[in-house]
């Protein structure tokens, strides 16, 4: 599998992974004890036909061209968890692995 | 996990799974011996904020609102394989499970 990595200076218009630091403090999300911020990344860019397609299915839908199918969009194709310490709804402190918090790769699907 | 199912008569505008039969014969993909057609399904519809979001990450990116982030799009969130019989590039007949050929659920990511 393969995905493009970009930064704020990139001129790449195609689907790409960009750096993004999520700052829980800035959001006012005080129930999150740690981390206060983390590198989440995000996906952005155009999905020209076949570029970075994750699934053969994406290609097949393009071929079949059904009503209302909008074509592939740039979305996470590989994600990873982070460990977090936070208060749950019952005000208990929880330490756990939260899935799909970091984008490792972007693709068209 | 939850996803909407629609059909061609549905008036649903939100992200939904629609039926789609992929016909390899109609594509002229004769290297595929079997099946000649299969139910693939596809995703289509709007992703209003928070509706059917697969990852907490999607919500966080929306909050952070970085340059160029287009918002979530309606994309497969659960897929399954099918068994296929086909010729490979060396003209050998291969029987195998091909991943991500059927959309089981759609969501916003």
């Amino acid at each position: 599998d393969f995905g493009l990595d970009c930064d704020e200076h990139s001129t790449e218009s195609r689907c790409c992974r960009y750096p993004l630091t999520v700052d829980f403090e800035a959001f006012g999300w005080d129930w999150i004890i740690a981390p206060k911020r983390y590198k989440a990344n995000y996906c952005s860019g155009e999905c020209e036909f076949v570029f970075l397609q994750k699934y053969p299915h994406t290609h097949l839908v393009h071929q079949a061209n059904p009503r209302g199918s909008a074509g592939p969009c740039c979305t996470p194709t590989k994600m990873s968890p982070i460990n977090m310490l936070y208060f749950n709804g019952k005000e208990q402190i929880i330490y756990g692995k939260i899935p799909a918090m970091v984008v490792d790769r972007c693709g068209c699907s | 996990d939850f996803g909407l199912d629609c059909d061609e008569h549905s008036t649903e505008s939100r992200c939904c799974r629609y039926p789609l039969t992929v016909d390899f014969e109609a594509f002229g993909w004769d290297w595929i011996i079997a099946p000649k057609r299969y139910k693939a399904n596809y995703c289509s519809g709007e992703c209003e904020f928070v509706f059917l979001q697969k990852y907490p990450h999607t919500h966080l990116v929306h909050q952070a609102n970085p340059r160029g982030s287009a918002g979530p799009c309606c994309t497969p969130t659960k897929m399954s394989p099918i068994n296929m019989l086909y010729f490979n590039g060396k003209e050998q007949i291969i029987y195998g499970k091909i991943p991500a050929m059927v959309v089981d659920r759609c969501g916003c990511s």
Epitope: - | E25, D30, W31, I32, A34, K36, L85, F87, E91
Partner: antibody
Framework: QVQLVQSGAEVKKPGASVKISCKAS????????MHWVRQAPGQGLEWIGN????????NYNQRFKAKATLTVDKSTSTAYMELRSLRSDDTAVYYC?????????????????WGQGTLVTVSS | DIQMTQSPSSLSASVGDRVTITCKAS??????LSWFQQKPGKAPKSLIY???RLVDGVPSKFSGSGSGQDYTLTISSLQPEDFATYYC?????????FGQGTKLEIK
């Protein structure tokens, strides 16, 4: 509808060759295996071999490897079988049949359509 | 090659009878067995595939059963049009091999 129409009866002398045809209609010819089967007078059925028209990949019964050659003409949706070095015991009706997959496993198929048969008579 | 032994080689029966034809493979063929009907001067016609599945358009008086090496074709109530020769075919392994046939005649 799906149809296989074979060429007419042939009479040949021993040592000669013959090429019989099977013209397909009503389906995508290139995407289905074509099989050939023979039946000597008053005898049972024998499998000769098959061919996949898309890429001409073929598979033969060893017994017929030196006897039969399977080819296709995609432009006319026609399968051919050439029989060489004919002998009197090659006198038989030769059938083409389409292999139809009901599933995806390598053996998940049956013959759904047969040609009407071509009688080849080898006589001096 | 897999040998297919069909029995009986001929069979006399009356209209309305129930008849059974058997086919024995020289090894396990994993239910990859088909049955055909052939009338004089005509091409074979597929009846049953995968041991017990009826081909579309074939009347339900025909049924197939069996597994491993042993298979049967049953015709539940013979009609005049059913008198013909019946063949089995194994498609588990190349080369494909047929049984020698069972000729079903009117008694």
């Amino acid at each position: 509808q799906v149809q296989l129409v074979q060429s007419g009866a042939e009479v040949k002398k021993p040592g000669a060759s013959v090429k019989i045809s099977c013209k397909a209609s009503g389906y995508s010819f290139t995407g289905y295996f074509m099989h050939w089967v023979r039946q000597a007078p008053g005898q049972g059925l024998e499998w000769i071999g098959n061919i996949y028209p898309y890429n001409s990949v073929s598979n033969y019964n060893q017994r017929f490897k030196a006897k039969a050659t399977l080819t296709v003409d995609k432009s006319t949706s026609t399968a051919y079988m050439e029989l060489r070095s004919l002998r009197s015991d090659d006198t038989a009706v030769y059938y083409c049949a389409r292999r139809y997959y009901y599933g995806t496993g390598p053996a998940d198929w049956y013959y759904d359509v047969w040609g009407q048969g071509t009688l080849v008579t080898v006589s001096s | 090659d897999i040998q297919m032994t069909q029995s009986p080689s001929s069979l006399s029966a009356s209209v309305g009878d129930r008849v059974t034809i058997t086919c024995k493979a020289s090894q396990d063929i994993n239910s990859y067995l088909s049955w055909f009907q052939q009338k004089p001067g005509k091409a074979p016609k597929s009846l049953i595939y995968r041991a017990n599945r009826l081909v579309d358009g074939v009347p339900s008086k025909f049924s197939g059963s069996g597994s491993g090496q042993d298979y049967t074709l049953t015709i539940s109530s013979l009609q005049p049009e059913d008198f013909a020769t019946y063949y089995c075919l194994q498609s588990d392994e190349f080369p494909l091999t047929f049984g020698q046939g069972t000729k079903l005649e009117i008694k």
